[in-house]
């Protein structure tokens, strides 16, 4: 007989199909795999099954954000008898399946890495045909990617009575710690804002109030490197404006 | 059976121009990234370029040695994969091999006989 | 780059010996587990033949007497006895970054 397991928010976990000793499903992935922005990470899943010799119609699947309902970034299909899997969908083109899922190995490369990825990633494998079947990691694998500092934008603003604001915005994996230096300044932190609300790896750090003319420098700096941009401030004196 | 037929290559003078082509068979070429790589007399193995598929959005590759003067394209519907090689050098002068690779792996499991090109003057 | 080197650049053997071939990445190319490594065979006027890939993993219709082993940046690719087919010109291959690159290549002649 078949017994369908369905989780508390109703989505489909897995299906048992019972019979003769056989291994159970299992999905074997790491808690947590790290790699650095620009370069390749590979997220490994291998699978057991019940279902001896099967060699029907297959689907890989990875899904990124959450289990059974996150956004698939991956998925590929092997026909009965096929050792190809044919990549029906790479996110941006750029995950490339490495594993054979007839070899109970979904292990995915992903290429190009962006600290946008620093997500956690689900494999699943469907079975259809004389079989239906179908598992999922429950708790995937972390992707957790590194970034050297980048400094995305360095601004003046005006502030009221005429005077002036510097903002400095970073991100970086760890987030950066960020240091102002200028004109009778000399190396200050400067009031650093946290990491925004989905903007995990973005630091900003402002300097309320720019008290000469000159340059200043915003250095952004973790374990990996440090990037430093400048913003020059020239008032027009005896005038209510700034060139910066 | 897969089989990858250059054809295209030959004497060439110093700056000019060619076009290489490959004819593939015993596979469903749409399924699979391809390759060019080449090996000068004698010497060792030199991968120049890749194409993807359709699903990867037909992206290119290419060695910096080559970056800017050849082009690397498909033909689906032909079965077909072309380089095209323009301000050619004396150190282009190399054997030319097709060269299939999967969708996963970017090792060469199929190879053409090559053809040869040469560049002199 | 990656750069690849191949010891030694020749290596001369009789039918029936084992043959250690050494392939060297001038950076790791294992990442999680999975080495980019790949070691083809080519012969005078013929085209080079996928032998392993990914380190270990043995290319369709190639014989059990070929073997690859390692991670990071040392490989071997070993044939545990010589066939007389088998002297011919070894290379590997990286597939870690872009642009992929190959080594020197290691020939196997016979003693």
């Known amino acids: 007989f078949v017994r369908t397991k369905i989780d508390t928010t109703e989505n489909l976990l897995n299906t048992e199909v019972h019979s003769s000793p056989a291994q159970r499903w299992s999905m074997q992935v790491p808690p947590e795999v790290s790699a650095e922005a620009g370069d390749a990470a590979v997220l490994p899943c291998t699978f057991t099954h019940p279902h001896r010799h099967y060699d029907g119609p297959l689907t890989a699947i990875w899904r990124a954000g959450e289990p059974y309902a996150g956004p698939q970034v991956f998925r590929c299909a092997a026909a009965r008898g096929s050792e190809l899997c044919q990549t029906a969908l790479s996110l941006h083109g750029r995950f490339r399946l490495l594993g054979n899922p007839r070899r109970n190995d979904l292990s995915l490369r992903v290429e190009r890495l962006a600290l946008a990825d620093d997500r956690r990633y689900f494999c699943r494998v469907e079975f259809a045909g004389d079989v239906h079947d179908r598992y999922e990691s429950r708790h995937g694998v972390r992707l957790h990617v590194t970034a050297a500092p980048r400094i995305v934008n360095i601004s003046v603003l005006p502030s009221p009575a005429h005077a002036f604001r510097a903002l400095c915005t970073a991100e970086g994996e760890p987030p950066p710690a960020l240091a102002w230096s200028g004109p009778a300044l000399g190396n200050s932190l400067a009031a650093v804002r946290s990491p925004r609300e989905g903007h995990g790896h973005l630091v900003t750090a402002e300097l309320p109030a720019l008290t000469h003319d000159g340059r200043y420098t915003c250095t952004a700096a973790n374990s990996l490197g440090r990037s430093e941009a400048s913003v020059y401030l020239f008032r027009f004196h005896g005038a209510s404006g700034a060139s910066t | 059976e897969v089989q990858l037929v250059e054809s295209g290559g030959g004497l060439v003078q110093p700056g000019g121009s060619l076009r290489l082509s490959c004819a593939a068979s015993g596979f469903n070429f749409n399924d699979y990234f391809m390759n060019w790589v080449r090996q000068a007399p004698g010497k060792g193995l030199e991968w120049v370029a890749q194409i993807r598929n359709k699903i990867y959005t037909y992206a290119t590759f290419y060695a910096a040695s080559v970056k800017g003067r050849f082009t690397i394209s498909r033909d689906n519907a032909k079965n077909s994969l072309y380089l095209q090689m323009n301000s050619l050098r004396a150190e282009d002068t190399a054997v030319y091999y097709c060269?299939?690779?999967?969708?996963?792996?970017?090792?060469?499991?199929?190879w053409g006989q090559g053809t040869l090109v040469t560049v002199s003057s | 780059e990656i750069l690849m080197t191949q010891s030694p650049a020749t290596l001369s053997l009789s039918p029936g010996e084992r043959a250690t071939l050494s392939c060297r990445a001038s950076?790791?190319?294992?990442?999680?587990?999975?080495?980019?490594i790949h070691w083809y065979q080519q012969k005078p006027g013929q085209a080079p033949r996928l032998l392993i890939y990914?380190?270990?993993n043995l290319a369709s219709g190639i014989p059990a007497r070929f073997s690859g082993s390692g991670s990071g940046t040392d490989f071997t690719l070993t044939i545990s006895s010589l066939e007389p087919e088998d002297f011919a010109l070894y290379f590997c291959?990286?597939?870690?970054?872009?642009?992929?690159t190959f080594a020197q290549g290691t020939k196997v002649e016979i003693k």
């Open positions: 291959q990286q597939s870690r970054k872009s642009p992929w």
């Open positions: 990914r380190a270990s």
């Open positions: 060269a299939r690779s999967l969708t996963g792996g970017d090792y060469f499991d199929y």
């Open positions: 950076q790791s190319v294992t990442i999680s587990g999975y080495s980019f």
